[in-house]
């Protein structure tokens, strides 16, 4: 978790002088509780936006927006703590809005936004906005949280972001797999425009079962420049096992930008359709 272009973070708006600060996610109002604390945020919204860095890279960011409740507690509102928790790693990043002037009621509802938390493809986050100071022990909570899932690199709009392109999202191998005679599979895919090797991972399964009955790995050497964007054809020999008929072919590239952590593409061949009631084979052949 990180912030995008850390230098230019602003939270001031007409009628409010405000500064954005790094936060340890442990505001001192936990340790030194105040008697009077503000109410919780209202209408917290988390949206996926896209932002460019100064270097021109495009990143997905969490756009956080909330409003204040129209009660007198805004007189005691000193700021807000914004926290983003990545759920699969428990990594947390916080920033603090520090109000340098007192809030006053005005004709419009106060609204705050922040769009600088960089999020990763296919990751889930819990976003929390805590009004400060935090409540006294056993006081009513004054935070709001929402969970938010970022689409993966297959998503059309995510595909062109820098983290997705770095993991090979622009490569479309257009895999085709056909079953040949004599227990063989013919795999065909389009090479990318990079002199890097590939690996074909074949996993076979019995019909309607998920434990594999055959596994095979095939190495494809780095293509020459004249072979870029051309089709590569590979014939894989299967183990002659009755019922080991569902095949998953996965192609793993080793692009320089993602090495052995590149996006993999796969295709599946289903077991051949079985007739519902097989025709009985007679023991003898009538001669008429």
């Amino acid at each position: 978790l990180r912030l995008l272009d850390h230098r230019a973070l602003v939270c001031s708006q007409p009628g409010l002088n405000c500064t954005v600060k790094n936060s340890t996610c442990l505001d001192d109002s936990w340790i030194h509780p105040r008697n009077l604390t503000p109410s919780s945020p209202k209408d917290l919204q988390i949206q996926l936006h896209f932002a460019h860095t100064q270097q021109g890279d495009l990143f997905p960011v969490a756009h956080i927006e909330w409003t204040l409740q129209t009660d007198a507690s805004i007189l005691y509102l000193e700021g807000a703590e914004l926290s983003v928790l990545q759920l699969n790693t428990n990594e947390r990043l916080c920033v603090r809005f520090e109000f340098l002037s007192k809030l006053r009621h005005h004709h419009r509802r106060w609204r705050f936004t922040f769009s600088h938390f960089v999020v990763d493809p296919d990751q889930e986050y819990e976003v929390t906005v805590h009004h400060l100071p935090k409540p006294i022990p056993d006081g009513d909570p004054n935070h709001q949280s929402k969970n938010f899932l970022v689409p993966d690199c297959e998503h059309a709009r995510m595909k062109v972001t820098t983290p997705c392109m770095s993991s090979g999202s622009l490569w479309d191998p257009n895999i085709t797999v056909e079953t040949l005679e004599a227990h063989q599979l013919r795999v065909s895919f389009t090479l990318w425009n990079e002199s890097t090797h590939y690996q074909i991972l074949l996993t076979s399964f019995p019909h309607m079962e998920n434990h594999s009955c055959f596994e095979h790995m095939h190495h494809i050497p780095a293509p020459r420049p004249e072979e870029f964007h051309q089709r590569s054809n590979v014939t894989l020999t299967l183990r002659n096992l009755k019922g080991c008929c569902r095949h998953q072919v996965q192609i793993q590239p080793f692009f320089s930008s993602c090495l052995n952590d590149c996006l993999r593409h796969s295709a599946t061949v289903s077991c051949p359709e079985m007739p519902d009631t097989p025709e009985p084979i007679p023991d003898y052949m009538p001669l008429w």
Epitope: D43, Q45, I46, Q47, L48, H49, A62, H63, E124, E126, S145, K146, N147, F148, L149, V150, P151, D152, E154, H155, A156, R157, M158
Partner: nanobody, 126 residues
């Protein structure tokens, strides 16, 4: 112009099933997460279920978990809600809603919706 049109509602006996559909147009359907939200007579809006853009993630309110199934067909630009073991308390106007941004609100407190359908009425009564 974004349009969401629900269908499939009606009067059904408790314990029976119903399948709601929502036909979408006017936006790139397979870019966005979609949700079902309901409003029982005299009550507020209640989020029922949501599904991510590629069906990779689905979420359900506790009150419908195990009975309702959300699905989508991106090629047909359609969202579905299969409702089984219906109860009287499922009686409501069911709305299809589009998530306002490309992410997916994966918790139960979802309200990031920018477009709604007109709703389809489901009445569960014997």
């Amino acid at each position: 112009r974004v349009q969401l049109v629900e269908s499939g509602g009606g009067l059904v006996q408790p314990g029976r099933s119903l399948r709601l559909s929502c036909a979408a147009s006017g936006f790139t359907f397979d870019d966005y997460a979609m949700h079902w939200v309901r409003q029982a007579p005299g009550k507020g809006l209640e989020w029922v279920s949501g599904i991510s853009w590629n069906s990779g993630r689905k979420g359900y309110a506790d009150s419908v978990k195990g009975r309702f199934t959300i699905s989508r067909d991106n090629a047909k630009k359609c969202l579905y809600l299969q409702m089984n073991s219906l109860r009287a308390e499922d009686t409501a106007l069911y709305y299809c809603a589009k998530e306002s941004s490309l992410g997916y609100c994966s918790g139960g407190s979802c309200s990031n919706f920018d477009y709604w359908g007109q709703g389809t009425l489901v009445t569960v009564s014997s």
